[in-house]
Every structure is written in C-alpha cells, then in structure tokens.
C-alpha cells in the first residue's frame, strides 16, 4: 500500500452486469480501503442516470430505503455493521431497467466515492432450424430456415456450407416487449446434387456460453435422373448371361421401372427384373437399343443404351459380365 496520506479509498465494481428478463440480478459494488487508511461510511446510495433522486439508500443509522421496495434489496449492508458492501439486488428485471447506475459511498473524511455500472437486460432466445423442401425451379429459393425467437439483444445468425448460398435475414418484435425474433433464410438455386446435403445455422448470443449450431438436411424434389450400367462394348456370342442395371437418382424414390426397346417390347433374350435387365445368351449377333423408363411422383425420365452382341472368340475378350 502507498505510504500514509497517499492512499485512497476506491469503489470496485464491474463496468457491465448482465441480467435476464424476469429474473433477479445483483449489481456488485464494494469499497476498497487501503491497509492503514481509516474511513467511516455513513451512507450507501444507488441512483439511475437521468433520474432525479435515489433508487436505494442505506443510511448508517436509519437503514435502507427504496424507491421500489418490492424490487430492490441491499444484499449485505446491515445496521450496526461496517458499510463496505453496497451490492444491490434487483428483482423481476424489466426491459426498461437497462441503463447506467451509480453506486456511491459517502465516506468520512474522504468524501463521496462512486462508480458507474451498466446493467444489460438480456433474454435468452430459443432457436430452431428447419428445411424448406423445394423442387427444381432454376431460380434461387429459400432451402433452409433458422429462427431465433425472443432474444435480447437480437441474436446473430450465420450460415456455414460448402454449397455456397446466400442468407436473407429479417427481424420482428418478439412476444415479450423488448425482445426480437430473428429469421434467416438460406437461399440457393436447387439442384439434385444439393439434395441430402447439410448446411449449418450458427446462432450467437450474449447469453450463450458458446454459439449454438443447428444442422439442416436439405431436401430437393426432382424427377429421376437415369443411366444404364453393366455394358462394356465387349459382348460376344456364346457367352454367359449378363445384367444391365437402370441407375436412377430421384426424390422422392422411383415408383416404377419400365424396360423397352426403340422397336417396342423387349426381345425374348431380355428379361426385366425391376431396375435390372437380364440378358440371356444368344446364338446370333444382335444390335438393339434398350430403353429404361423410370417414374417417380414428379414425372418420368428415360435412358437409352445400344447393345451389340458380336461374333468372335470370347476367350480373348473380357466379354459380358458373368453371374
């Protein structure tokens, strides 16, 4: 401590205190007295900036008096005890309680010592995220929606994705006075490649220890995208059976597969088994264009494949896929 006559009593308090709407909060305020310094506190006073008069006073001989006795209470000050702790509890926090407060000690012989504290009135928001199910539009549309309800101050919403996309964020007053509901839409041109992918909504707020992450699984409805696999251009007479597969990606799932040829129905050597087509061994060369038609709730799409079965020694070639 400094030598006698150079020390000073100081008021210690945080510059800012957070409290939650409807809850109680303590505004801490203490008098720090150097070791050898004698001081006598006759009065503790709390006042709000911009308001005349005091909201709470604790007098050494008269005890406490409050502007709103049901909402205010000195936490530690007691009659007959040394007044070193002016901490004040506020009950039933309201939006209008937010502001600057002065905690003041009247000390003898040092005089008045005060400090200002900013009370922040917070409301913890509730967060939800949901998919916006879309069809192929060719235009940017909202594909995910993230809502932070009843926050004070408004929550900050950001989106994280490898897919690009643009946020569109808006605010409206919350249910409770002074609170805000923030809605953020994630906007992208829908494509089949995006279906089933994830985007993350990140919500940040003063009341959270860490940001809240909400994952949205994207849904894009699109008609089937069809291709046929299983043919390698090396099919020869006399070889075993082979299988062609009709590969279809769609949302919702395909409801039906229909195999045909450009000439009409399937020839005898081709047997349809749902998404697969069984090609039986043939004894003469063929050159046929096969068609797979896939249907889902949004429509039908087809793929064509020209298959040739040629003459030649099968042992020298990879040939048809064997079962």
């Amino acid at each position: 401590w400094p030598p006698p006559g150079t020390g000073d009593v100081v008021v210690q308090a945080p510059t800012q205190v957070p409290g939650f709407l409807g809850d109680s909060v303590t505004l801490p305020c203490y008098l720090q007295v150097p070791n050898m310094e004698v001081t006598h506190v006759s009065q503790l006073t709390w006042a709000r900036h911009g308001e005349s008069g005091s909201m709470a006073v604790f007098h050494q001989t008269q005890g406490p008096s409050y502007s709103e006795s049901k909402r205010l209470e000195f936490v530690a000050a007691r009659l007959g005890a040394e007044l070193r702790n002016a901490s004040l509890r506020m009950f039933g926090l309201r939006v209008e309680d937010e502001g600057n407060y002065t905690c003041l000690f009247v000390t003898f012989p040092q005089g008045s010592r005060s400090v200002d504290i900013w009370l922040r009135v917070l409301a913890k928001p509730q967060n939800t995220a949901e998919v916006q199910k879309v069809q192929l539009t060719g235009e940017p549309v909202p594909m995910a929606r993230c809502v932070s309800t009843g926050g004070r101050p408004p929550a900050q919403i950001t989106w994280h994705s490898d897919l690009g996309g643009m946020p569109n964020t808006s605010q409206v007053p919350g249910f409770l006075s002074g609170t805000v509901t923030v809605t953020s839409l994630w906007i992208l041109v829908p494509s089949s490649q995006v279906d089933g992918k994830n985007v993350t909504c990140k919500v940040e707020h003063e009341s959270f220890e860490k940001p809240q992450l909400l994952t949205v699984n994207l849904t894009v409805y699109y008609p089937p995208e069809v291709s046929i696999s299983g043919y390698d251009n090396n099919w020869y007479l006399g070889q075993n059976e082979a299988t062609l597969t009709c590969d279809a990606r769609s949302n919702p799932e395909p409801t039906g597969y229909n195999w045909s040829t450009t000439m009409g129905p399937l020839p005898p050597f081709a047997v349809a088994q749902g998404a697969q087509l069984l090609i039986r061994p043939v004894d003469k060369p063929i050159n046929t264009t096969l068609i797979c038609n896939v249907t889902n709730a949004l429509g039908a799409r087809q793929a064509e494949l020209t298959v040739q079965v040629k003459e030649g020694p099968p042992s020298e070639h990879s040939g048809i896929s064997r079962n």
């Epitope: 150079t6 150097p34 310094e37 006759s42 007098h59 007959g80 003898f108 008045s112």
Partner: antibody
Framework: QVQLVQSGAEVKKPGASVKVSCKAS????????ISWVRQAPGQGLEWIAW????????NYNQKFTGRVTMTTDTSTSTAYMELRSLRSDDTAVYYC??????????????WGQGTTVTVSS | QAVVTQEPSLTVSPGGTVTLTCRSS?????????ANWVQQKPGQAFRGLIG???NRAPGVPARFSGSLLGDKAALTLSGAQPEDEAEYYC?????????FGGGTKLTVL
C-alpha cells in the same frame, strides 16, 4: 442556524479527569461527524479525535488513545469529550467542530466557542 | 507525526490576489490528504472554508479557492477584501488522523 455551544471553563488538578460537553442545534445531530481539537497557550491546533454521532463510532489520535473517550447523547444532541489522567500540558482551549459535507468533500464547518481547561496543582 | 508548515504571515492589498500554501513534512501533498482550510477572525469562532482540497463550503465567497500547487496545498484569495483579514489554518489527513498547520496571519493592507 447550526450552532455548537460548549460547557464552561474548568480548573482541574493533575491526575484528575475532565468532561467537556458540546450541545448541537440547527441540524440532524445523528447524521453528523464531530471532531475535538485543542490549542495549548502559544501552541498550534491539535486534533484529538472524531465521533459519528449516530452510532458512536470513533477514531482517536494515537497520542490520546487510552486517555480520551468521546461519547454522544442523541436525546439531547450533545457530544462529550472526557480526558483522564490530566497533566499540566493538557492545559488548553478545547474546541468541538462539526464536519459539513459539500456533496463531494468534508470540511470543518461549524466550531464551538471553545472550553478552557486549566490543569494546575 | 507529520508536520504541516504554513507561511507565518502574508500581506495583500485590497482587491489583490494572494496564495497561502501548506507543506507536508512527509512529501508532496496529494488529493488523498483532503486538505481543509479554516478561517479565524479575531474574537470570532473558527469557520470552515474549503474541504477535500478544492470544495468550497456553502456560503463561502467565490474569491476563495483551494487547489494543489506543485507539492503543496494552496488557498488562493482573488480580490481580497478588508474583512478577509484573519488567521488561516490548513488541515491535512494522514490515513488515520488530522494534522493542523501553524496558521498564516493574513493582513489586508
């Protein structure tokens, strides 16, 4: 107006005690700090102690600790200073002074007229 | 204990300005000494002028002002009046006790 009226002059023998009174009027006595100060003949002013009238809390000059006691009687708005084991060098004019508050700092506001204490065998 | 030293006497002309100072034997006077100034006119009671270094007591004319001047406490009288002729005492706080200066006899001549 604010006034401090002290008791009359005292003549005491060495080793005796003296009790000087200081009656306050014109303000809220219980919210006040009162200091006692003395001035020996041909000497400067010397601070003895202060008391907070409302609670009786005191702070003494270490030089006088054990020999001086300050008290208040809130019913009569009177402060008292008792000095024991009197010596000849305690001969002085004893003053009570009320501390006033400007809203920022304290000052020695109003003084009593003084009480002459003579210690002589 | 600390010793508080003041000019034994000063003279000022009516309407003039004079500064009374107050030195501490322990070093520089600071705001933590809460310098007080009191006035005593002949045959009258003491009267408080300044508290807490620079806070003027109610009813004290604005021509009296308190401050710190270098390493000393100071009482400045601007525009001295004949009725300001008096003894002026400085009082300093030293953590747990007050110490009075020897006083300055101010003559307005």
């Amino acid at each position: 107006q604010v006034q401090l009226v002290q008791s009359g002059a005292e003549v005491k023998k060495p080793g005796a005690s003296v009790k000087v009174s200081c009656k306050a009027s014109g303000y809220t006595f219980t919210s006040s700090y009162i200091s006692w100060v003395r001035q020996a003949p041909g000497q400067g002013l010397e601070w003895i102690a202060w008391i907070y009238a409302g609670t009786g809390d005191t702070n003494y000059n270490q030089k006088f600790t054990g020999r001086v006691t300050m008290t208040t009687d809130t019913s009569t708005s009177t402060a008292y200073m008792e000095l024991r084991s009197l010596r000849s060098d305690d001969t002085a004019v004893y003053y009570c002074a009320r501390h006033g508050y400007t809203g920022r700092g304290w000052y020695f506001a109003v003084w009593g007229q003084g009480t002459t204490v003579t210690v002589s065998s | 204990q600390a010793v508080v030293t003041q000019e034994p006497s000063l003279t000022v002309s009516p309407g003039g300005t004079v500064t009374l100072t107050c030195r501490s034997s322990t070093g520089a006077v600071t705001t933590s000494n809460y310098a007080n100034w009191v006035q005593q006119k002949p045959g009258q009671a003491f009267r408080g002028l300044i508290g807490g270094t620079n806070n003027r007591a109610p009813g004290v004319p604005a021509r009296f002002s308190g401050s710190l001047l270098g390493d000393k406490a100071a009482l400045t009288l601007s525009g001295a009046q004949p009725e300001d002729e008096a003894e002026y005492y400085c009082i300093l706080w030293y953590s747990n006790h007050f110490v009075f200066g020897g006083g300055t006899k101010l003559t307005v001549l």
